[in-house]
């Protein structure tokens, strides 16, 4: 399939001119090479017309161009002075000769219709109103009005001022007059639809002496927009229908043949094709809204129509608006999983792609919430704080970098199942969707910390181990502090990796974090996980709380496991009160509902990363003289 | 057909009004459909406001809803803008445009402009 897009049909009159955009891929290549237009004929062949390399054809001179737009991957084709032998079939395209990728477009041009002279054009789009002025002479201004629609034969009445109304124009057409000007009458016909189209004729007073004036109604139906996404980006359609429709209920279709299926609409309908991946925001009190769809696939190109309608439904003679969607095969985003699983007890890492480009961007994690409207809270992100009911068990590492973050849940529950966003403050178009599925736990997990019941004593020497099975063997160990800006990684020492690499004894595979001594500041949640490089495996949470030393007694560590665990060797230590910027108020709520969620994260002003950003290991260190960490406070 | 000559226009600050005026000569002001046009240094021309013959249909762009206010007055042969909130986007030479036929104003006429200068 190729991957240009453009208009496939463009109609026009005689006289006027055209403007035709397509779009191509995003790579340099394209960016450079030849742009095209071309006529299709009888044969097959496309003669070129126009191109980028400076040809004009004799037909088109003066009076077309064509411009490459490489920061958007448009080219823009224009024609002017019309005439209807320009009507065919064309294609642009991409490449050296014009067999290269290219989209069909048919263009009509059609004659100016014959209309009487001193024809008042009105042209209006579906669904909206106009008002007819029917200018009379002041001697006719006690006679009767009237505004009829012409026919093959006859003029059929549409309204008159006797207050007769053709039903078809019941409750939508008023006459009337404006204040005391004696020399116009006015009707208004509101929801207009195709039908309404065509030649009226205003008459005040009868026979000879009466005032006649001649009315052409155009109802367009609206250009539909192009949109030219690439395959798992996301798209906005923005909606904007009016002050009149401000109150009535919203929706989203696609065109399917002769109807348009709702995809979703304010009174809580959506399709199931879309779910975990759909949101619907009412903008303002002026009747815009706008549908956010992430993850797209290729399934999702089409003609889409949004409107406003008290039923949520499509209705002939409302507002639209329509727009042709384009999925680019050929996408930047990467091929991730779209369903992540993981068990009871257990946990998840999430790679959550970004534009490469954009490495300083903030990048966020919500959970798509299918109640109401649909809408995002944030749950994490580098300058929001975790929501506290994720306390201890969810975390965002702004890293491996280039392209990709991790979030990490643990301590998973079934009620963790669902769909879960990852996007930044930047490029909207790199919004993903996640699914998250959990099932119930049939097995021990594989990292198990010891002792359960962590209660360090304050001041004295703590130690917790974290055991890992054989497999985890050549993967980098590690322990963090968590706190709700992040997870910290901390010194550690691997008793297993000690061990020749020929046998794995399954039961002395363990990673010890000692605290030494024991500080107030220490009591909290400590994960302990598994990485290969920067790619995160999976993790497990411990609470270690911090109590006072009981009198006449000594704290004696309570397992055998802990009488195994080896000191670590003298490290570079980091402190775990790491300086962090204040978690700044995110601007701008909206589909992400309360003051914690994000609507247009584009829009936001790009912001440098706090510096100590979530799951960096680069806080203040220092180093320490004993054989054990010190946390210094 | 009809003649037509803006003006009003000059430099203001941003946040700052104006009004331009388009005066209509040599036919019947009423015939035509009346509206506003603009071209910014190095850009099309693009529409801002128009009225229908007798007032009754206005339009206006998207970028100056709600600050833009266009009427007319056929016993004076005058069509008329308010701009109010000016942003340093407005700044263009203002062209006002007659149609014997169509709103939409096309613009079978035209004015030979006034310039408007919007500074921050």
């Known amino acids: 399939k190729s991957p240009i897009f453009g208009p496939q049909e463009v109609s026009s009159i005689e006289g006027d001119s055209v403007s035709i955009t397509c779009y191509y891929p995003d790579t340099s290549v394209n960016r450079h090479t030849r742009k095209y237009w071309c006529r299709q004929g009888a044969s097959g062949m496309c003669t070129t017309l126009i191109s980028s390399n400076g040809y004009l054809s004799k037909e088109y001179s003066g009076r077309a161009n064509l411009i490459n737009f490489p920061e958007n991957n448009t080219f823009v084709i224009n024609i002017e002075q019309l005439t209807q032998d320009d009507t065919g079939s064309y294609k642009c395209g991409l490449g050296t000769s014009n067999r290269g990728l290219s989209f069909d477009v048919s263009l009509e041009v059609s004659q100016v219709p014959e209309l009487p002279s001193d024809t008042h054009v009105y042209t209006k789009d579906i669904g909206r109103n106009v008002t007819i002025e029917c200018p009379f002479k002041r001697e006719n201004a006690p006679s009767k009005k009237s505004l009829c629609k012409k026919t093959n034969q006859s003029c059929e009445l549409v309204i008159d001022s006797t207050e007769k109304v053709n039903p078809s124009y019941i409750g939508r057409a008023k006459l009337f007059m404006k204040g005391t000007d004696l020399t116009v009458f006015y009707v208004n016909i509101s929801h207009l639809t195709h039908n309404d189209a065509g030649l009226y004729i205003c008459q005040a007073g009868e026979g000879p002496s009466a005032d006649k004036k001649n009315v052409d109604l155009q109802v367009l139906a609206p250009e539909p927009e192009l949109l030219y996404k690439d395959l798992r980006s996301s798209v906005t359609f923005e909606c904007d229908l009016g002050r009149e429709v401000a109150n009535e209920a919203k929706y989203l279709c696609r065109m399917n043949k002769e109807t348009c299926d709702v995809i979703i609409n304010t009174l809580g309908k959506r399709d199931p094709d879309f779910e975990g991946r759909i949101l619907i925001t009412p903008k303002d009190d002026n009747g815009r809204f706008s549908v956010l769809i992430t993850g797209l696939r290729k399934e999702d190109a089409g003609h889409y129509q949004c409107g406003a309608h008290s039923s949520g439904l499509p209705q002939e003679g409302w507002p639209i608006q329509t727009w042709q969607l384009f999925v680019n095969e050929e996408s930047t985003i990467p091929n991730r999983r779209s369903v992540v699983k993981g068990v009871t007890g257990g946990s998840v890492a999430i790679a959550c792609p970004y534009n490469p480009k954009e490495s300083s961007s903030l990048k966020y994690w919500c959970r798509w919430e299918g109640d109401g409207n649909g809408h995002c809270p944030v749950l994490v992100g580098t300058q929001a704080q975790v929501q506290e009911e994720y306390e201890g068990r969810l975390a965002l590492f702004d890293q491996p970098g280039n392209g990709t973050y991790t979030v990490i849940l643990n301590q998973l529950t079934t009620e963790d199942a669902g769909f879960y966003w990852c996007l930044t403050n930047g490029d909207s178009r790199w919004r993903t969707t996640i699914e998250l599925q959990v099932a119930e736990a049939t097995r021990e997990p594989n990292l198990e910390v010891t002792p359960q019941n962590a209660t360090a004593v304050l001041g004295e020497t703590f130690t917790v181990s974290c055991h890992y099975p054989c497999k985890f063997y050549s993967q980098e160990k590690y322990w963090c502090k968590w706190s709700n800006k992040g997870c910290h990684i901390l010194p550690s020492h691997d008793e297993g990796a000690r061990q020749s690499s020929v046998s794995c004894d399954q039961s002395s595979q363990l990673v010890s974090m000692t605290l030494n001594p024991v500080s107030k500041e220490d009591e909290g949640w400590y994960w302990c996980g598994v990485k290969q490089g920067q790619t995160y495996g999976e993790t497990t949470a411990i609470y270690i709380a911090v109590e006072e030393r009981t009198r006449g007694s000594s704290h004696v560590n309570p397992t055998d496991a802990n009488a195994r665990a080896k000191v670590a060797l003298e490290e570079e230590v980091v402190d775990s009160s790491i300086s962090e910027k204040e978690n700044k108020a995110i601007p701008n709520p909206g589909p992400f509902a309360n003051e914690r969620e994000i609507q247009n994260v584009g829009d936001q002003a790009q912001e440098n990363r706090a510096s100590g950003d979530a799951g960096s290991a680069d806080g203040q260190s220092r180093s320490s003289s004993s054989k054990h960490h010190h946390h210094h406070h | 057909q009809v003649q037509l000559v803006e003006s009003g226009g000059g430099l203001v600050q941003a946040g700052d009004s104006l009004a331009l005026s388009c005066a209509g000569s040599?036919?019947?002001?009423?015939?035509?459909?009346m509206g506003w046009f603009r071209q910014a240094p190095g850009k099309e021309r693009e529409f801002v406001a128009d009225i229908s013959w007798y007032g009754a249909n206005i339009g206006y762009a998207d970028s100056v809803k709600g600050r833009f206010t266009i009427s007319r007055d056929n016993a004076k042969n005058m069509v008329t803008l308010r701009m109010n909130s000016l942003k340093p986007e407005d700044t263009a030479v203002y062209y006002c445009?007659?149609?014997?036929?169509?709103?939409?104003?096309?613009?079978?006429?035209w004015g030979q402009g006034t310039q408007v200068t919007v500074s921050s």
């Open positions: 040599g036919d019947t002001f009423s015939n035509y459909a």
């Open positions: 445009a007659a149609d014997r036929n169509h709103w939409p104003v096309k613009g079978d006429y």
